[in-house]
Structure formats: structure tokens, C-alpha cells
């Protein structure tokens, strides 16, 4: 088992909004849960976009999940990752 490296980034979207993206990389096996939480509970699937789980060329995998949020509300969101029985949460950088 190779645990993922998780990185959260933010980028400008439309006025007053930002897109936050949670990337998991360099993990094996390929089964992973990557999702956003808002106010400590699950964010609905229809407000999240997932990338495919793809090989990264080193025998490991990468994927991502993104959502659009209002600027100033970053503190309400965390990215949750679960892989091979281990899990972690990751805040949006300010």
C-alpha cells in the first residue's frame, strides 16, 4: 500500500466565487474516497466534480475532486480522503 499525497488548491471562478480542488496523488491501490465536506457533513454529489482515477506513470494513481464555493466561506469546507483503511481531512488554504 502506498498512501496518497493530498493537496488542496484554490482558483478564481466567477465573481464572488472560487473553485477549490483537492488532489490525491501517488497512491496504490487505486480504490480511494475523495470528497468535500461542508459544515462537517457531506457535500451533495451534484455540487462536486470528480476526475477519473488515472495511473501517474509510477505504478501509482492520481485523482481529484472540485467544488465551487463563495469567496470568504473557505473555512466551512474540508476535503476528506479515505484510502486502504486510513483517512484524513484537509482544509482550504486561506
Amino acid at each position: 500500500t502506498v498512501p496518497p499525497m493530498v493537496n488542496v488548491t484554490r482558483s478564481e471562478a466567477s465573481e464572488g466565487n472560487i473553485t477549490v480542488t483537492c488532489r490525491a496523488s501517488s497512491f496504490y491501490p487505486r480504490n480511494i474516497i475523495l470528497t468535500w465536506r461542508q459544515d462537517g457533513v457531506s457535500l451533495s454529489n451534484d455540487t462536486q466534480q470528480w476526475g477519473d482515477v488515472l495511473p501517474d506513470g509510477n505504478g501509482t494513481y492520481q485523482t481529484w475532486v472540485a467544488t465551487r464555493i463563495c469567496r470568504g466561506e473557505e473555512q466551512r469546507f474540508t476535503c476528506y480522503m479515505e484510502h486502504s483503511g486510513n483517512h484524513s481531512t484537509h482544509p482550504v488554504p486561506s
Partner: antibody, heavy 119, light 107 residues
Framework: DVQLQGSGPGLVKPSQSLSLTCSVT???????YYWNWIRQFPGNKLEWM?????????NYNPSLKNRISITRDTSKNQFFLKLSSVTTEDTATYYC???DGRGAWFAYWAQGTLVTVSA | DIQMTQSPASLSASVGETVTITCRAS??????LAWYQQKQGKSPQLLVY???TLADGVPSRFSGSGSGTQYSLKINSLQPEDFGNYYC?????????FGAGTKVEIK
């Protein structure tokens, strides 16, 4: 370390409003986290009532309809529960509690405040 | 709303025994589950979150497991201080709801 302390009247008459205060020490309620009210009925059933967040937003249990209000006084580092039009069914031990944005589990609780609704 | 059904409602066990408490959610809660212990006259205390993670200071004889709609709390080698009420709580969505509780008594 953060501490929460609930307070308020132990007896409320039916049809009146129940008002409780949670005083927080060791952490500013505007910095982060979600500041909740939970009650436990006789017989031990637990019910989440709602929260006020670090930013001042609310989320309430729909079962309480329009009877509940959670507000705060940032200068005193306190948050408040107001439950209107109470009946004897609102007799319970009321807890204030905190969770963080990693997940809505309650790591910090105040001691309970028993509120009896009776004429 | 997601309903949480806990079983058994009560159990009697001796010190040193292993006990298991189960919690069933009315929908898939994807491991968004916490367990609490409550002693008589005290506030609930967090034991486990994210279905499997022990809270700070919780002894390793406690363990959480499960997935989907079915979850368990196991206590290995029950100690005198473990007697009390245990509750599960989901945090998949609002409103947050708790199980009705399991009372663990001394046999």
C-alpha cells in the same frame, strides 16, 4: 483548553420561551468551529437542535420548526438558545457542545442544564 | 432524515468480557459515524469518529468498524469504568441524529 458552561432557569411555564446561555472560555467562538445545542429527554433520547457557526450562520433541526433561535454575543464569547412556545415535551437536559469542520462529531460538551416545563 | 437504530437496547456483561454494540442507519452514511459513552449524570464523551478513529485518550480496547448502513462498537476486555450508556450518531447530512442508546450493565 476550551471549556463550555451552560446556564439558565431550571423551570419554565408552558407556552413561554426557554432561554439558555453557553459561556465559552479558552477559545473565541468567532475563530472557528460550530457551536451547538443538543438536548436529552427523560429516557435518554438525544436530539441535535442546531448550531451557530464561527461566521454567525445557523442550521436548525427541522423538527423544531420555527420555534428555535440560536444567537451569540461575541463580546462576551457566549451563544444562546431560545425555544419558544414550550410544552411539557420540551422537558430535557440541555447541552451546549462544539464540533469542528473536519466532521460533525462532538468532542467538547458542557455539563447539562436540566429544564423542566411545568405550570 | 436518516434514522439510527441501535441494538441491543441493553446488555449485561462481566468484567473481562468482550461486548459489541451495533448501529444501523436508514441510508448509506459512508462511515460518517461517531460513538459516545455517557455515565450517569454526566455529559456524553466522544469515543470514535469517522466510524473507526479513536478520539484522543480513548483506550485501545475500544474499536469501531462497519460501512454503508451497518456499524459496530466493540469493547475488548470490559473494564469497570466502561459501564454506562453508549450512543451512535451520524453526520452524513443534517439533521444530525443519534441512536436510542445501549445500556451496558454489570452482570
Amino acid at each position: 483548553d476550551v471549556q463550555l458552561q451552560g446556564s439558565g432557569p431550571g423551570l419554565v411555564k408552558p407556552s413561554q420561551s426557554l432561554s439558555l446561555t453557553c459561556s465559552v472560555t479558552g477559545y473565541s467562538i468567532t475563530n472557528d468551529y460550530y457551536w451547538n445545542w443538543i438536548r436529552q429527554f427523560p429516557g435518554n433520547k438525544l436530539e441535535w437542535m442546531g448550531f451557530i457557526s464561527f461566521g454567525g450562520s445557523n442550521n436548525y433541526n427541522p423538527s423544531l420548526k420555527n420555534r428555535i433561535s440560536i444567537t451569540r454575543d461575541t463580546s462576551k464569547n457566549q451563544f444562546f438558545l431560545k425555544l419558544s412556545s414550550v410544552t411539557t415535551e420540551d422537558t430535557a437536559t440541555y447541552y451546549c457542545a462544539r464540533y469542528d469542520g473536519r466532521g460533525a462529531w462532538f468532542a467538547y460538551w458542557a455539563q447539562g442544564t436540566l429544564v423542566t416545563v411545568s405550570a | 432524515d436518516i434514522q439510527m437504530t441501535q441494538s441491543p437496547a441493553s446488555l449485561s456483561a462481566s468484567v473481562g468480557e468482550t461486548v459489541t454494540i451495533t448501529c444501523r442507519a436508514s441510508g448509506n452514511i459512508h462511515n460518517y459515524l461517531a460513538w459516545y459513552q455517557q455515565k450517569q449524570g454526566k455529559s456524553p464523551q466522544l469515543l470514535v469518529y469517522d466510524a473507526i478513529t479513536l478520539a484522543d485518550g480513548v483506550p485501545s480496547r475500544f474499536s469501531g468498524s462497519g460501512s454503508g448502513t451497518q456499524y459496530s462498537l466493540k469493547i475488548n476486555s470490559l473494564q469497570p469504568e466502561d459501564f454506562g450508556n453508549y450512543y451512535c450518531q451520524h453526520f452524513w447530512s443534517f439533521p444530525l441524529t443519534f441512536g436510542a442508546g445501549t445500556k451496558v450493565e454489570i452482570k
